[in-house]
Interface confidence: low
């Protein structure tokens, strides 16, 4: 049976397609190609006479068609209008006609897409953002990636418009990622450049550091306020309700008990229209011990069994208004998950003790004008002999 085959079936615009013929009869007078599913003289592309080897263009010929002696038809520089059915009519020597119909589909070569947005600076927990993949194209699949990964499953993400539009509802700061869209059809694919979403958020409840609330007379007060916010917030301070400078850091040299009171940090984000604040009480002691006495370390035990026992080391001092630091082999502690400080750093707990914890420990007490170290204490770590295997 006479058949035709398109090579390829899906063709990129501007490329060429070959309509191959299979099972061509032996004794032939000639053949003719038509656009469409039937023989129609008005839609003849080309006729070919075997005897004269003469090709005659028909009304539907565009000048891009070439017919071969084996009846195959080559169409070059195809356009989307070329999509559809093609019918071959074979005229045998007995002038009996035989027909076969084939088809192919022309797809456009896709351009590099781009992403447009209805909101380039959305506000967290307030705005939605719709990304649209441009351009709009027929018979095209639209794909999206976030940070190089396919879209996560989330009720806040919605694809619409044939997946051409990606909507993020109730955006959060975690949505500030790189978004890429891709387009593909049967013959080509392309990706957009990444677009990073700039989510406006905050200001969150600020944090004042350092966390200390008690200070000694003569010390410098250096308070820093930080709030997560995009863009960075405006900072201002109030002491006992009285406005101070509009800076992130509040510095007062050589404080006295007159500086006791409430210290409030205010943050505002003009872009989100939101504000936040935090209040901290500061107490300044009247007297400052000029010299810190030498502290002592007390240990719950100094010889322990590794991987089994725990140990508590306590730094004893009679001084007030001091801070405490711990050291082990010249390294500041804690240095591992197993080490915990408590009671304002007075107690160092190690649970469980391991071989690498063996060695000398000491503590240091200090205030703004002096410091002193304890004598070191030696911690010994033993391991019970393992039982012999049979």
């Amino acid at each position: 049976q006479l058949t035709t085959e398109s090579m390829p079936f899906n063709v990129a615009e501007g490329k060429e397609v070959l309509l191959l013929v299979h099972n061509l009869p032996q004794q032939l007078f000639g053949y003719s190609w038509y656009k469409g599913e039937r023989v129609d003289g008005n839609r003849q592309i080309v006729g070919y006479a075997i005897g004269t080897q003469q090709a005659t263009p028909g009304p539907a010929n565009s000048g891009r068609e070439t017919i071969y002696p084996n009846a195959s038809l080559l169409i070059q520089n195809v356009t989307q209008n070329d999509t559809g059915f093609y019918t071959l009519q074979v005229i045998k020597s007995d002038l009996v006609n035989e027909e076969a119909t084939g088809q192919f589909h022309v797809y456009p070569e896709l351009p590099k897409p781009s992403i447009s947005s209805n909101n380039s600076k959305p506000v967290e927990d307030k705005d939605a953002v719709a990304f649209t993949c441009e351009p709009e194209a027929q018979n095209t699949t639209y794909l999206w990636w976030v940070n190089g990964q396919s879209l996560p499953v989330s009720p806040r993400l919605q694809l619409s418009n044939g997946n051409r539009t990606l909507t993020l509802f109730n955006v959060t700061r975690n949505d500030a990622r790189a978004y890429v869209c891709g387009i593909q059809n049967s013959v080509s694919a392309n990706r957009s450049d990444p677009v990073t979403l700039d989510v406006l958020y905050g200001p969150d409840t600020p944090i004042i550091s350092p966390p200390d609330s008690s200070y000694l007379s003569g010390a410098n007060l250096n308070l820093s306020c930080h709030s997560a916010s995009n863009p960075s917030p405006q900072y201002s301070w109030r002491i006992n309700g009285i406005p101070q400078q509009h800076t992130q850091v509040l510095f007062i040299a050589k404080i006295t008990p007159n500086n006791n009171g409430t210290y409030a940090c205010f943050v505002s984000n003009l872009a989100t229209g939101r504000n936040n604040s935090i209040v901290k009480s500061i107490t300044v002691s009247a007297s400052l011990s000029p010299v810190v006495a030498k502290p002592q370390i007390k240990a719950s035990k100094t010889t322990v069994t590794g991987d089994k026992d725990s140990v508590n080391l306590t730094c004893s001092t009679n001084d007030t208004g001091i801070s405490i630091r711990w050291f082990f082999k010249n390294q500041s502690l804690p240095s591992s998950e197993r080490m915990k400080l408590s009671q304002g750093n007075i107690t160092l707990s190690i649970n469980p003790v391991k071989r690498e914890d063996a060695g000398t420990y000491w503590c240091e007490v200090f205030n703004p004008i002096s410091k002193n170290q304890s004598d070191p204490i030696m911690l010994n770590v033993n391991y019970n002999a393992l039982p012999q295997e049979n």
């Epitope: 947005s117 940070n147 190089g148 790189a178 450049d193 677009v195 990073t196 700039d198």
Partner: antibody, heavy 121, light 111 residues
Framework: QVQLVQSGAEVKKPGSSVKVSCKAS????????MHWVRQAPGQGLEWMGR????????KYVPKFQGRVTITADTSTSTAYMELSSLRSEDTAVYYC??????????????WGQGTLVTVSS | EIVLTQSPATLSLSPGERATLSCRAG??????????LHWYQQKPGQAPRLLIY???NRATGIPARFSGSGSGTDFTLTISSLEPEDFAVYYC?????????FGQGTKLEIK
């Protein structure tokens, strides 16, 4: 921390090929594009192309199309740039640089130390 | 491709002075109003070093005397008070679209 270590200097004959490697550490190269930039003696910086190590897709400047091949081996976190049909004007220092959201916020924050390729007969 | 033109080609200044370097793009390098334009510093025998990314963001470890501004097609790198180590070649680069072109460079030299 991010580190990029490139292969050593090369001296090549005109018409031959050179393959420069760039081993990355401190980040996952699948999360970035790996770019190659060259600089001829006394000249400015010239972007050559890039690869997406996650899928092997590469893109080249038309000037180098057909002569340059950029590849990546994610198992060893190494990117490669091969330049063929070398000519004297290819004498340059070749740099690799990761580029992407995770590592460099869409700029070239980190660079390899550079590989000098000298083309001379 | 997007052509970047830097000016001046050479800038002769003394330590302590203010330096203003310009980079002009042949077409906008903005994405959603943010310029994908970056500044690099390069000293002889060294790889380039990122100073400013996306027009105005200082890269990690870059001193506050370096600042960037601009959007669309016109961008500026400013060094408020030159230090001796700032004398080098400065390049701008756009990553808005392929190919990711560089400017031809501005050489900042000691007067």
């Amino acid at each position: 921390q991010v580190q990029l270590v490139q292969s050593g200097a090369e001296v090549k004959k005109p018409g031959s090929s050179v393959k420069v490697s760039c081993k990355a550490s401190g980040f996952n190269i699948k999360d970035t594009y790996m770019h190659w930039v060259r600089q001829a003696p006394g000249q400015g910086l010239e972007w050559m192309g890039r690869i997406d190590p996650a899928n092997g897709n590469s893109k080249y400047v038309p000037k180098f199309q057909g002569r340059v091949t950029i590849t990546a081996d994610t198992s060893t976190s190494t990117a490669y740039m091969e330049l063929s049909s070398l000519r004297s004007e290819d004498t340059a220092v070749y740099y690799c640089a990761p580029f992407g959201y995770y590592v460099s916020d869409y700029a070239m924050a980190y660079w390899g130390q550079g590989t000098l390729v000298t083309v001379s007969s | 491709e997007i052509v970047l033109t830097q000016s001046p080609a050479t800038l002769s200044l003394s330590p302590g002075e203010r330096a203003t370097l310009s980079c002009r793009a042949g077409e906008s390098v903005d994405i959603f109003g943010v310029g994908f334009l970056h500044w690099y510093q390069q000293k002889p025998g060294q790889a380039p070093r990122l100073l400013i990314y996306r027009a105005s963001n200082r890269a990690t470890g870059i001193p506050a005397r370096f600042s960037g501004s601009g959007s669309g097609t016109d961008f500026t790198l400013t060094i408020s008070s030159l230090e001796p180590e700032d004398f080098a070649v400065y390049y701008c680069q756009q990553t808005n679209e392929d190919p990711y072109t560089f400017g031809q460079g501005t050489k900042l030299e000691i007067k």
